[in-house]
């Protein structure tokens, strides 16, 4: 080890200056007594090194790079050795930005996996290894007073979401939740959410079915469809409202929305449709009147309206 580089900081803001020093020990006797130390950033030679002999006989070269514009580069100090460059030492330099404040933090409670899933947008690329941690605590009130801390949730590399398992949750009690981003240049924190996991519950959609025609019931009128749905059993006791959407299978028509329907309707006659036409239908639900998230749309049901010509004006109505 004839040479050693030390730098003012191995990680800096992109575009900031960086100062490095390369010292060659005196006992490297095979070297030229007055060696000229050269600097190289990546493959490019860097002029401007100031070289001096120190009192102990070692040689030192100091260089200041006015702007480090590479997010990653190797800085090396070297000597001319015959016709080649002999590298004495090299260091990795990194440049980037401190983490921006994570934004758009949102959470949903998945009752099937029994976990609170939170996601966020990390902000612009920092060009540096940046860790994100979902932090939370339990709170009796509106999160002004902090209760028990909850174990940090650390997402897998590259992911901007994390799941807090049920054992760390208290339903019907507020939690303070925020994201902390950290890298070598700094730390930032998102604004804090204060929420009861049940207020961000996302239900599973009901299963749409065609209504089994009963012998005594009149067949559907032209342009009408008789529907029923089976509620998601695990969400049965949650008051909710639902909405249907439908569109003809052929053509470029957009979805038409029908609702709100109370989940308890369970049956519905949808009218005002084109006769003898195949339709695609879906349903989704949301906890209501308490807060919640809309479920995904249900798997599609495909039904055809009857061909008989309508005899009077049709409209939506509940059974």
């Amino acid at each position: 080890e004839c040479g050693h580089i030390s730098v003012s900081a191995p990680i800096v803001h992109l575009g900031d200056p960086i100062t490095a020093s390369c010292i060659i020990k005196q006992n490297c006797s095979h070297l030229d007594p007055e060696p000229q130390i050269l600097w190289r950033l990546g493959a490019e030679l860097q002029p401007g090194g100031r070289q001096q002999r120190l009192s102990d006989g070692t040689q030192e070269s100091i260089i200041t790079l006015p702007h480090l514009n590479h997010t990653q580069a190797f800085l090396s100090c070297a000597l001319n050795w015959g016709n080649s460059l002999q590298i004495l030492d090299q260091v990795e330099l990194r440049a980037g930005y401190p983490p921006a404040i994570p934004h758009n933090l949102s959470c949903l409670m998945n009752l099937t996996t029994s976990s609170l899933i939170c996601q966020w947008e990390p902000g612009p690329e920092t060009h540096l290894p940046t860790s994100f941690t979902l932090k939370s605590f339990k709170s009796r009130g509106n999160c002004q007073t902090q209760g028990d801390s909850i174990l940090d949730c650390v997402p897998k590399d590259g992911q901007s979401h994390c799941s807090i398992p049920r054992k760390h949750l208290l339903l019907y009690q507020n939690m303070g939740i925020w994201v902390q981003a950290e890298n070598a240049l700094g730390t930032s924190m998102s604004p804090q959410l204060c929420l009861d996991p049940m207020d961000v519950v996302k239900l599973e959609p009901p299963m749409l079915r065609t209504m089994d025609p009963s012998p005594e019931a009149a067949p559907p009128q032209a342009g009408c469809l008789q529907l029923s749905w089976e509620p998601w059993q695990a969400g049965l006791h949650i008051n909710q409202k639902c909405e249907l959407r439908h569109k003809p299978q052929r053509g470029e028509a957009s979805w038409a929305l029908v609702g709100p329907l109370p989940l308890e309707a369970l049956q519905y006659e949808l009218c005002g449709l084109l006769p003898a036409t195949a339709y695609t239908l879906q349903i989704r639900c949301i906890r209501w009147p308490l807060p919640g998230h809309w479920s995904d749309w249900s798997p599609s049901l495909e039904l055809r309206t009857t061909e008989r010509a309508p005899t009077h004006h049709h409209h939506h109505h509940h059974h």
Epitope: L111, T112, T113, S114, R166, K167, L171, M198, P231, Q233, A234, L236, H237, I238, N239, P262, L263, E264, A265, L266, P289
Partner: antibody, heavy 118, light 107 residues
Framework: EVQLLESGGGLVQPGGSLRLSCAAS????????MGWVRQAPGKGLEWVSS????????PYADSVKGRFTISRDNSKNTLYLQMNSLRAEDTAVYYC???????????WGQGTLVTVSS | DIQMTQSPSSLSASVGDRVTITCRAS??????LNWYQQKPGKAPKLLIY???NLQNGVPSRFSGSGSGTDFTLTISSLQPEDFATYYC?????????FGGGTKVEIK
């Protein structure tokens, strides 16, 4: 304070009918599912039936399906259980209870005893 | 229908003991498992809902754990007022079903 008070229990002959009532107070009755749970003497708990907040959904235990009818009157904050074709095995203390959103029972009434015997 | 199997059906313990009661569902019920305490001549009382949430007013010596098919109610240090019968109940799907009960008696 949430309170549930059952009434209407008593002695009835096999094949007879009885109507149980449960008067609720201390909460917005019309927003909650309600249910009936029974307990035969010296036995465990058995769910009988539940009813959704506005009365449109009414699941029943197989053992009472077709004989019992659950209903509610939200204007009177009252839950009912109409019991027909009663059998000896229906003898039990009948509890009315408020259901939580994820299907737990809390609180419970004090219970009313139904005895089916000749 | 989902069957709930509780064990043991009875146990004897002393004040201060740690007591564990288990409940097994015949199929997966996620976290839809609730625990009740019942004393003779009284209505049941909710202790734990959704597997691990302690109901308001219930002492912290009671705790619940588990998910899927296997669940546990633990009383960390048994108190004189805890001698009672304990029931589990699944609320994943109707019919709602209870375990057979576990009677906790004084040794």
């Amino acid at each position: 304070e949430v309170q549930l008070l059952e009434s209407g229990g008593g002695l009835v002959q096999p094949g007879g009918s009885l109507r149980l009532s449960c008067a609720a107070s201390g909460f917005t009755f019309s927003l909650y599912w309600m249910g009936w749970v029974r307990q035969a003497p010296g036995k465990g708990l058995e769910w009988v039936s539940s009813i959704s907040s506005s009365g449109g959904v009414t699941p029943y235990a197989d053992s009472v399906k077709g004989r019992f009818t659950i209903s509610r009157d939200n204007s009177k904050n009252t839950l009912y259980l109409q019991m027909n074709s009663l059998r000896a095995e229906d003898t039990a203390v009948y509890y009315c209870a408020k259901l939580g959103e994820l299907g737990w029972f809390d609180p419970w009434g004090q219970g009313t005893l139904v005895t089916v015997s000749s | 229908d989902i069957q709930m199997t509780q064990s043991p059906s009875s146990l004897s313990a002393s004040v201060g003991d740690r007591v564990t009661i288990t409940c097994r569902a015949s199929q997966g019920i996620s976290s839809y498992l609730n625990w009740y305490q019942q004393k003779p001549g009284k209505a049941p009382k909710l202790l734990i809902y959704y597997a691990s949430n302690l109901q308001n007013g219930v002492p912290s010596r009671f705790s619940g754990s588990g998910s899927g098919t296997d669940f546990t109610l633990t009383i960390s240090s048994l108190q004189p007022e805890d001698f009672a019968t304990y029931y589990c109940q699944q609320s994943y799907s109707t019919p709602l079903t209870f375990g057979g009960g576990t009677k906790v008696e004084i040794k």
